[in-house]
């Protein structure tokens, strides 16, 4: 690879925890997306958490490290958690540069393979760890 | 083919500006950075930043900072290097490059009185 | 900065003899993720440059396997097995690890 990985970084206020001492922040000004330069992997994450009427994000940035699904060229989130009722934490990883801006797709809330009720359940702020 | 084409020669006065353009064909533009390196008269090479052209996010070199503005224009696949506040040793032959493996032609750029 | 060192910087060489370009970083160029972001580049007389290698030792498309970049850290070499006449021109190491992205000073290939 030519260049060291970039990813968007992004941490959602009251969000316990930081991803970003795992890259170095650039310099990109106030209308521009955050951006970070992965300091120990090649691969970008994103946090969504899915209610009935929307998607929002809670996280992005860089991971700690390489694992299964860094290989993906698009960020194609899974289902992890449930943070609360009626909410869904999906989470992606991807191995291209701001591939962790947005995500390809989310299956709507209850539809085929997300965690049912029993699902792991967590405090707002305290499930991106979960997640990740 | 990757080509990358850049504006023609400029000769421009101490303390102007002069604002080069890269145009790419070839590839997808919005999935490479894009880098700007220069060359003085008979020296070596230097990194001036990079910018990517899905999101405008720039890197630069911080000698350069203040001074130097890239941008892009995705309809026409064409990025742009600004310099500002010229000086004599400002001249030279300004490069850019699809990260680092396919390079423009190059722009001289002369800063006269 | 990271400053990046060439020796020697000005290589006479016979054709079909080989050549070798050493280069040396004043931090080590690997990265936290496993890679080292070291790069050789040709420009050839009134060309813009190409690049030869990337990765320390992974030829670029196109390039002649005569090319071969090897070293670590903050050790690295250019090898020519057998210097062509095509060959001439200056040479030089790149660092991508490290912001600023630097390069040498250049090597000057020429043929005795």
């Known amino acids: 690879p030519p260049n060291r990985r970039t990813c968007v970084f992004f941490e959602a206020p009251g969000v316990r925890g930081s991803t970003k001492t795992l890259g170095e922040l650039l310099d990109t000004g106030t209308e521009l997306p955050r951006a970070i330069r992965c300091l120990y992997s090649r691969c970008c994450f994103g946090i969504w958490n899915l209610t009935q009427d929307r998607a929002q994000v809670e996280m992005q940035g860089c991971r700690d490290s390489d694992e299964p699904g860094c290989e993906s060229l698009h960020c194609d989130p899974s289902p992890r958690a449930h943070p609360s009722p009626g909410s869904t934490l999906f989470t992606c990883s991807c191995g291209t540069d701001f591939c962790n801006a947005n995500y390809s797709h989310l299956p709507p809330p209850g539809s085929p393979g997300t965690p049912g009720s029993q699902g792991p359940q967590a405090a707002p702020g305290e499930s991106i760890w979960m997640a990740l | 083919q990757v080509q990358l084409v850049q504006s023609g020669a400029e000769v421009v006065k101490p303390g102007a500006s002069v604002k080069v353009s890269c145009k790419a064909s070839g590839y997808t533009f919005t999935d490479y950075w894009v880098s700007w390196v220069r060359q003085a008269p008979g020296q070596g090479l230097e990194w001036i930043g990079e910018?990517?052209?899905?999101?405008?996010?720039?890197n630069f070199n911080e000698k350069f900072k203040g001074r130097v503005t890239m941008t892009v224009d995705t309809s026409t696949s064409t990025a742009y290097m600004e310099l500002r506040s010229l000086r004599s040793d400002d001249t030279a032959v300004y490069y850019c490059t699809r990260q680092r493996d396919y390079w423009g032609q190059g722009t001289l750029v002369t800063v006269s009185s | 900065d990271v400053v990046m060192t060439q020796s020697p910087l000005s290589l006479p060489v016979t054709l079909g003899q080989p050549a070798s370009i050493s280069c040396r970083s004043s931090?080590?160029?690997?990265?936290?993720?496993?890679?080292?972001?070291l790069e050789w580049f040709q420009q050839r007389p009134g060309q813009s440059p190409r690049r030869l290698i990337y990765?320390?030792?992974n030829r670029f498309s196109g390039v002649p396997d005569r090319f071969s970049g090897s070293g670590s850290g903050t050790d690295f070499t250019l090898k020519i097995s057998r210097v062509e006449a095509e060959d001439v021109g200056v040479y030089y190491c790149?660092?991508?690890?490290?912001?600023?992205?630097?390069f040498g000073q250049g090597t000057k290939l020429e043929i005795k």
């Open positions: 990765g320390v030792s």
């Open positions: 910018i990517y052209p899905k999101n405008g996010v720039s």
């Open positions: 931090q080590s160029l690997e990265y936290g993720d496993g890679y080292t972001y």
């Open positions: 790149f660092q991508a690890t490290h912001d600023p992205n630097t």
